[in-house]
Interface confidence: low
């Protein structure tokens, strides 16, 4: 622990004025782990004048930094670059004449206390006035600065000509691009002092490069990946006083892919689970034994989770019987393409057939084709839900099924097994 300081596993405090410290406290190698330090308190250190760029970087877990009644005159711009956990900074009664917002812009500070410093009235500290004005808490500080006549001026009254917040404005209200294509986003910035323009692209996967010319900037994104759909891109204008940003959400359009289709599982209902990716949202259509499966309250598609351009869901079946056994194909399509995937589903054996003693009964419960297969001739009986002679009317009520209309947009008809016989035999 440095001279004139005391240390614990999580705190460093340097409050003894004599002999005092002349540099920001650093821990000796092989002593306390600096990453565990959450609080540093420095007081009465008149000879501590500077915080250098690398003084604080080791204290990555630092939350509270207090330097009061000391001689602090200068803080390096990048001093707190590695201290993303900093929440409270108190530099009360030091010798700071200027302090840039660049020191703190990446931090999510709850408190920045700066009273009792001899700030010089200039555009450099106008950001503090703006910060005070936008702060929601009523306990705003009484900050002052020294004007040209060395008179104390309340920061709240500070008027500096040509010193205001910048503005940023994107040229496009929304940004929709097809996967693999390229796009250029334009942005205009303005303000006095003239702001710098930069782009915040977050974790954008696609290759991108930017160019700035005067108050106009452009961001070129090439070979756009579908993984970037939903990401936010921001144009930021920054000057001494503060920053403004305008953001746009990137929407990437791409053809659907059925990334997952599995055999039925039974919970409250039977479910054929699937995952589909695509944008715009793909239209889903199921086929049963090669024919269109019209949905009803007994058989319907449910999307349970939507993760922007990925949809997780089920083909939900109410009380399926042996008559629902067969091949189920999911087709997903949008204006950029389509995908098909098929499984074979086996819900229960045929009544009266002991299939353990019947070697001809299929034991394969499902298969998975990742490429489209022959989905059958829809003019034959492939869209017929297989029927048996069911004598018990109460059972028959549970075995009502849908028959598909030729036209996709046609009315869905709920019919019974008996109707199915008539429909196909007359």
């Amino acid at each position: 622990c440095p001279m004139s300081c005391k240390c614990s596993t999580t705190r460093i405090w340097c409050t003894e004025p004599s002999p005092g410290i002349v540099a920001f406290p650093r821990l000796e190698p092989n002593s306390i782990d600096p990453e565990n330090i959450t609080e540093i308190l420095i007081a009465n250190q008149k000879r501590l004048e500077i915080i250098n760029e690398d003084d604080v970087e080791a204290y990555v877990g630092l939350k509270n930094l207090t330097i009061v009644d000391s001689g602090l005159k200068f803080v390096a711009y990048k001093a707190f670059l590695k201290n993303g956990n900093l929440r409270h900074i108190n530099f009360t009664r030091n010798k700071l004449t200027s302090l840039s917002r660049r020191h703190f812009r990446h931090l999510d500070l709850s408190d920045l206390i700066l009273t009792g410093n001899p700030f010089t009235c200039s555009c450099d500290i106008m950001w503090l006035k703006t910060l005070q004005e936008t702060k929601s808490s009523p306990d705003t500080q009484d900050l002052y600065c020294l004007n040209e006549s060395s008179k104390n001026t309340p920061l709240a009254n500070l008027q500096i000509p040509n010193c205001g917040l910048p503005s940023a404005r994107l040229a496009a209200p929304n940004l929709t691009v097809e996967e693999g294509k390229s796009v250029t986003i334009s942005c205009s910035v303005g303000g006095d002092p003239l702001p710098t323009l930069y782009w915040d692209v977050g974790n954008l996967v696609s290759k991108h490069m930017n160019e700035t010319s005067h108050t106009q900037g452009s961001l070129r994104i090439t070979n756009i990946s579908s993984d970037d759909s939903g990401k936010q891109i921001s144009c930021v204008a920054e000057n001494l006083v503060g920053e403004d940003q305008d953001s746009v959400n990137l929407t990437v359009h791409f053809a659907p892919t059925i990334t997952f289709l599995e055999s039925p599982t039974s919970d409250h209902h039977w479910c054929i689970p699937f995952t589909v990716r695509g944008n715009p949202k793909p239209a889903l259509q199921w086929f049963y034994n090669g024919a269109i499966l019209n949905e009803s309250k007994y058989i319907c598609t449910k999307i349970h989770v939507t993760n922007h351009t990925e949809y997780h869901g089920c083909l939900q079946l109410d009380n399926p019987t042996h008559m629902n056994n067969g091949d189920y194909t999911l087709m997903a399509k949008n204006e950029y393409g389509k995908d098909e995937r098929q499984i074979s589903a086996h819900f229960m054996g045929r009544p009266g057939v002991d299939y353990e003693t019947n070697p001809n009964y299929p034991e394969v419960l499902y298969e998975d084709w990742t490429t489209p297969t022959d989905i059958g001739d829809t003019t034959n009986k492939s869209n017929e839900i297989p029927s048996t002679d069911v004598a018990d009317q109460t059972n028959r009520e549970h075995e009502q099924k849908l028959i598909s209309e030729e036209d996709l947009g046609g009315e869905q008809k709920l019919i019974s097994e008996e109707d199915l016989h008539h429909h196909h035999h007359h």
Epitope: A171, P173, N174, S186
Partner: antibody, heavy 119, light 112 residues
């Protein structure tokens, strides 16, 4: 065919407020910024502000901040501009205009709404 | 703010004549990367809404007669009507879109 149909003329008293509408048809409202422009009698055109119909985000000419409020109703494809604390200086024709190509130029305009502020 | 100045404020020509009008901006409207000038020209006939004629300083909007030509770059721009017709009686406005939007004061074209 793209059309911007504005509400009819308004005669209002000083100090009152007025809300002008602009119904878009022939295109998807959310694909383009909607701009509003003022033209006082015999004078030039002044850009008031614009709105991004997707999220309701607005930009204003500094001169009209506090005077004009822009909104949209996506369900009816209609943009609105409310003008408050009206004075005779606000008497003018007000246009809505669709912002094309990143809103750099205005390719379709409404027919204009005449506002007269008089006691 | 960018200030747009148009001249002359009005001019009268005979049908068939060539006419030019000027528009100057207080700062460059050229984006050096895209090579685009953020300037448009609009025509407003009496009792009508403005109509887009030219954008990017020189690109004619579809349906606009080819007698209308836009030219210029940076801060100085010109709208030329090669052979004025009676139906061209209107006020012509330039507008910048480099930073927000500002219109010029307009040039009134009268037919003798």
């Amino acid at each position: 065919e793209v059309q911007l149909q504005q509400s009819g003329p308004e005669l209002v008293k000083p100090g009152a407020s007025v809300k002008i509408s602009c119904k878009a048809s022939g295109y998807t409202l959310t694909d383009y910024y909607m701009n509003w422009v003022k033209q006082s009698h015999g004078k030039s055109l002044e850009w008031i502000g614009d709105i991004n119909p997707n999220n309701g985000g607005t930009s204003y000419n500094q001169k009209f901040k506090g005077k004009a409020t822009l909104t949209v109703d996506k369900s009816s494809s209609t943009a609105y501009m409310e003008l408050r604390s009206l004075t005779s200086e606000d008497s003018a024709v007000y246009y809505c205009a669709r912002g094309a190509y990143y809103s750099n130029y205005f390719d379709y305009w409404g027919q204009g709404t005449t506002l007269t502020v008089s006691s | 703010d960018i200030v747009m100045s148009q001249s002359p404020s009005s001019l009268a020509v005979s049908a068939g004549e060539k006419v030019t009008m000027s528009c100057k901006s207080s700062q460059s409207l050229l984006n050096s990367r895209t090579r685009k000038n953020y300037l448009a020209w609009y025509q407003q006939k009496p009792g009508q809404s403005p109509k887009l004629l030219i954008y990017w300083a020189s690109t004619r909007e579809s349906g606009v007669p080819d007698r209308f030509t836009g030219s210029g770059s940076g801060t100085d721009f010109t709208l030329t009507i090669s052979s004025v017709q009676a139906e061209d009686l209107a006020v012509y406005y330039c507008k910048q879109s480099y930073i927000l939007f500002t219109f010029g004061s307009g040039t009134q074209l009268e037919i003798k």
